[in-house]
Structure formats: structure tokens, C-alpha cells
Amino acid sequence: KVFGRCELAAAMKRHGLDNYRGYSLGNWVCAAKFESNFNTQATNRNTDGSTDYGILQINSRWWCNDGRTPGSRNLCNIPCSALLSSDITASVNCAKKIVSDGNGMNAWVAWRNRCKGTDVQAWIRGCRL
């Protein structure tokens, strides 16, 4: 599923991401835009053999199990396929664990490079939330 901007904002708010661990909803929508272009089925292979999955491009080296990433930690205890669902519950639950580590949202390269320090509230402007 490819979400609309406001549709995703509403879904993320419903799943408890607004101000989760101090990160406003705009941060999460912005991250999703530049990680996956709002596409829940986005996958991208990395040079180390791991793969990033779903709307928040969660990595198989650390967070999920895809059966083909050597030494995967699977810290979210889920199959990576669960991160490709049109239901973003698994991606959000896992993202909450990721952001609860010391690096916060810096764990997402796209957030760090494209969203951090910008007017992220623009990503939810005009949305009925």
C-alpha cells in the first residue's frame, strides 16, 4: 500500500507515534517519506547483505528476520515480511523499540539527512488529525 501523506499521519497518530519519546508526528511522517515514499512494500538491499523493509525501512541485520541475513539479531522478534503489511502495526511497534535506544531517530539515515532540524510540522500541515 502507498499511503497518502495525511492518511499516514492519521495512521501513525492512531498507533501512538505522535510525541513518542519526544518525537512529534511530523518527524515520523517525514522519515517515512524519505525512507519509503510512503510505500509499505518498499524493500532495499544493502551492501552488507541486509535488507531494509517497509514504510520505515527497518533493517534485517538488527530488527527483523528475513532468513537470509547472516547474524541477524531480530531485536523486534518478527519476520521481516510483517513489515511489508498495509497494516503498519508491526512497523510502528518495531520503530518504537528502535527509537528507545540511545540514538533516537538518528537510527534512520533519511531522517538524519532530510528531516532533522527542518520544519517537520509541514508534513502534517492541512491534515485532519
Partner: antibody, heavy 113, light 107 residues
Framework: DVELQESGPSLVKPSQTLSLTCSVT????????WSWIRKFPGNKLEYMGY???????FYNPSLKSRISITRDTFKNQLYLQLNSVTTEDTATYYC???????WGQGTTVTVSS | DILMTQTPATLSVTPGDSVSLSCRAS??????LHWFQQKSHESPRLLIK???QSISGIPSRFSGSGSGTDFTLSINTVETEDFGMYFC?????????FGGGTKLEIK
Amino acid sequence: DVELQESGPSLVKPSQTLSLTCSVTGDSITRGYWSWIRKFPGNKLEYMGYISYSGSTFYNPSLKSRISITRDTFKNQLYLQLNSVTTEDTATYYCAEYDGTYWGQGTTVTVSS
Amino acid sequence: DILMTQTPATLSVTPGDSVSLSCRASQSIGNNLHWFQQKSHESPRLLIKYASQSISGIPSRFSGSGSGTDFTLSINTVETEDFGMYFCQQSNSWPYTFGGGTKLEIK
């Protein structure tokens, strides 16, 4: 299945340091986030802090600089240190997997002279 | 810190009744609310995560609802093994905090 087991002295004198160990079996502690939670007499629960897979620690500000959570990845053990204890620190101390799925059986620590 | 308030403090019910336990947060916490059961001399057991998400191995008579500041744990047809303490916990903002608990006791 994952099992957690707390151990340490059941009696600590005021002003001393409370030191507890949590031994984890069934999973590597580098594959998770691990918490220390305590329950006071009268049922109040307090989330003391946690340590992440990367070794990052988060401490409850109410415990200020008294608390330290560390780990030994080779022994697969977690440690809690609480300095300068008072009688108010008398509680049952639990280590738990961060998601709340797995808990130790708890160990009761009394602070008394 | 976010203050979690549980009501009532004690709930007296007869096995077979259906009950609702309330938990209120002092500020919005989205769906970042978890429910635990603790019986005497036992460790807490996770019943519901993220307000309404079920947990493997937990009987289906337990369900959760709510978002923002007001949350409810429902037990559909209470069984004798359900008596004990129930706690809610928020994980929206650090430090995570627990409610004071509701004691479910036999009438």
C-alpha cells in the same frame, strides 16, 4: 523460553550500596532491552531504568545519580547498583525484558540497620 | 512525569461477572499503554500491549481499549484465576510510569 533470575543480598544497611544480578537464560542479552523495576510495600511499582541491546542506559530521574545498570555479555547477566540506600528503598526488585513479556521472580531487599 | 491513575482501587466481583478497569493518564500517551496482572507472590504478567493488542497465551476474555488519556481493560466473564492486582503502565515518555493498581477481589 527466556528465563530471568535475580540474586543478591536480602538485607542492606542504610547508606550502603544495593547490588543485584539478573541471570538470563534462553536468549542473549545482546538481543534485547532489559529493565529493572521495583515494587514497594503497598503495591506501588517504579520503573527504575533499562539497558538496550547497544548498551545505552536510561535511568529514572527520581533516582538521580544513585543508579547504575550494567551488563556482562559473556556471562549473560545484568546488574543493578543503587547507592546510598535508605529505608525507602525497601522493595521487591524485578528484572524484566523491556517489552514486559518476561520477568524474573523478584527478590525482596530490606534496607535496615 | 506522566501520572497514571487507576480506578477503582478495589473491585469486588462474582465469578461470571464482566468487569471494566479504568486507567487515566495525566497527558496524552497515544496508544502507549500496557496492562499487567499480578497475583500474590507472583511476577507481573503482560495481558495487553499498546492499549488493545493481544498477547499470545492470554485468554481472549481480556481485552483493552482507549487512546490518548483514557483506557479500559475489560474482562468478559471473570474466572476465579483472574483475581489479583491489575496495573497499567505508559511507555510514551521516559520515565515510564505505572498506575497505582486495581485489586480485583471475590465478592
